[in-house]
């Protein structure tokens, strides 16, 4: 006899990175017929939802109208069909951004490089933080961590055209509270210099569409919640 139901999927809309004072919805998708969903935050019960009618609904939403550092952290959800509970979902790391200050991002040896050149990003923030995060915009949120007193180096090593794209960095005050994003830095990697076509292989977006990027990133992954779950889950490990 089955003791538990399959674990639900958990994700955040529009994104797991939420600017402070902005809204976010945590989604939990289980099975049709689930009579109760529980959202847990940092290991404790945070909210309950009982869908009506349960046989027509397999997803619930927990709305956070005003994101702040107290709401940032690890979320998971479970659901119940009759008396049988599911396994807990993977952990969702919900991050509050736009805290305190804005770092500056620079790229060495410059924004235009040749395939094979060694590239390093530098993220600098003069306030009290020792962890930095470098993100490449695009369909998947590639995140690297770096450490340093006021700046961190992110060596990409010899680059290929796959490194083309727009990068931003954040200072991290703790795992779930990040600074404002830096201004974007666009890296152009030329494979064959004779052919200076610079169309990036990952979709990238202009400086003023960071919000759109976040939405696009999430939308792209909504089709596969497992992938998004995995991305979010591994982001801060």
């Amino acid at each position: 006899q089955q003791q538990t139901l399959p674990k639900p999927f958990i994700w955040a809309e529009p994104h797991f990175m939420v600017p402070k004072e902005k809204q976010v919805t945590i989604c939990c998708q289980g099975n049709y017929g689930a009579v109760e969903y529980q959202l847990h935050f940092e290991g404790s019960l945070f909210a309950v939802d009982r869908p009506k009618p349960p046989e027509r609904i397999n997803k619930v939403q927990f709305y956070i109208p005003d994101m702040n550092s107290r709401m940032a952290g690890q979320y998971s959800c479970i659901y119940r069909v009759g008396e049988l509970w599911s396994e807990p979902s993977n952990l969702l790391d919900l991050v509050v951004t736009e805290m305190y200050d804005t770092p500056t991002l620079s790229v060495h040896p410059g924004p235009e490089v040749i395939s094979g050149e060694k590239v390093t990003f530098y993220c600098r923030l003069d306030t009290a933080t020792s962890m930095f995060l470098l993100l490449k915009e695009g369909r998947s949120s590639h995140v690297q961590r770096g450490y340093g007193k006021v700046q961190a180096e992110f060596p990409l090593g010899p680059v290929t055209t796959a490194h083309r794209g727009t990068y931003r960095c954040f200072g991290s005050y703790n795992n779930h509270a990040w600074s404002f994003p830096s201004e974007p830095v666009k890296l152009l990697v030329t494979g064959d210099i004779e052919n200076t076509s610079l169309a990036p292989e990952d979709p990238t977006f202009p400086a003023d569409t960071w919000g759109t990027y976040l939405l696009t990133t999430e939308t792209g992954l909504q089709k596969d919640h497992a992938l998004w779950d995995h991305t979010a889950q591994n982001l801060l490990r």
């Epitope: 620079s106 060495h108 410059g110 040749i114 530098y122």
Partner: antibody, heavy 117, light 107 residues
Framework: QVQLQQPGAELVKPGASVKLSCKAS?????SYWMHWVKLRPGQGFEW???????????NYNEKFKRKATLTVDKSSSTAYMQLSSLTSEDSAVYYC??????????WGQGTSVTVSA | DIQMTQTTSSLSASLGDRVTISCRAS??????LNWYQQKPDGTVKLLIY???RLHSGVPSRFSGSGSGTDYSLTISNLEQEDIATYFC?????????FGGGTKLEIK
């Protein structure tokens, strides 16, 4: 067009310091690394170091770490290099140069530093 | 640091000549080799980057070749305005390093 303007010459006494300037125009000053290079008569160029104006990150040649200090003034798009405890070995032409694309593609005219009592 | 060696410190040639200047690196620099021209008045210009790519505005009589540790700059039809000192520079590893220069004179 891209321009890097440097004063022509500086005469300084041994043991003193000198601050060389390089005023940039024609490109986004904060986005590109400013390099400084030394050229002594009859010798090759020596790379001193570089600075990125956006956040002041620097890389130095180990040989010049105690000799040169690189700074920038973003408001005037000017880069500076201070040379300290000058000796006759520091008499040289000093160039500022930037990499806009794939190499050091724009150079200043150079400042000739003469260290003499 | 990577050592860059230009074995010929000076070179005499006639106008119209084909001139080749060589440069050797102390280790493989993966084609990240640039050539610069310093005119007698001190002006410095980039000629060639990434071994063989002509910088914009540089006459096509200049060309570069090489791989691994050995590189060369060729001027196919020497003109009066080419009288200068030529330096190679590796951009593969920090710190960037330069050759000692080859001074080109007219016979």
């Amino acid at each position: 067009q891209v321009q890097l303007q440097q004063p022509g010459a500086e005469l300084v006494k041994p043991g003193a310091s000198v601050k060389l300037s390089c005023k940039a125009s024609g490109y986004t000053f904060t986005s590109y690394w400013m390099h400084w290079v030394k050229l002594r008569p009859g010798q090759g160029f020596e790379w001193i170091g570089e600075i990125i104006p956006s956040n002041g990150v620097t890389n130095y040649n180990e040989k010049f770490k105690r000799k040169a200090t690189l700074t920038v003034d973003k408001s005037s798009s000017t880069a500076y290099m201070q040379l300290s405890s000058l000796t006759s070995e520091d008499s040289a032409v000093y160039y500022c140069t930037i990499r806009l694309r794939y190499a050091l593609d724009y150079w200043g005219q150079g400042t000739s530093v003469t260290v003499s009592a | 640091d990577i050592q860059m060696t230009q074995t010929t410190s000076s070179l005499s040639a006639s106008l119209g000549d084909r001139v080749t200047i060589s440069c050797r690196a102390s280790q493989d620099i993966s084609n990240f080799l640039n050539w610069y021209q310093q005119k007698p008045d001190g002006t410095v210009k980039l000629l060639i980057y990434y071994t063989s790519r002509l910088h914009s505005g540089v006459p096509s009589r200049f060309s570069g070749s090489g791989s691994g540790t050995d590189y060369s700059l060729t001027i196919s039809n020497l003109e009066q305005e080419d009288i200068a000192t030529y330096f190679c520079q590796q951009g593969n590893t920090l710190p960037p390093t330069f050759g000692g220069g080859t001074k080109l004179e007219i016979k």
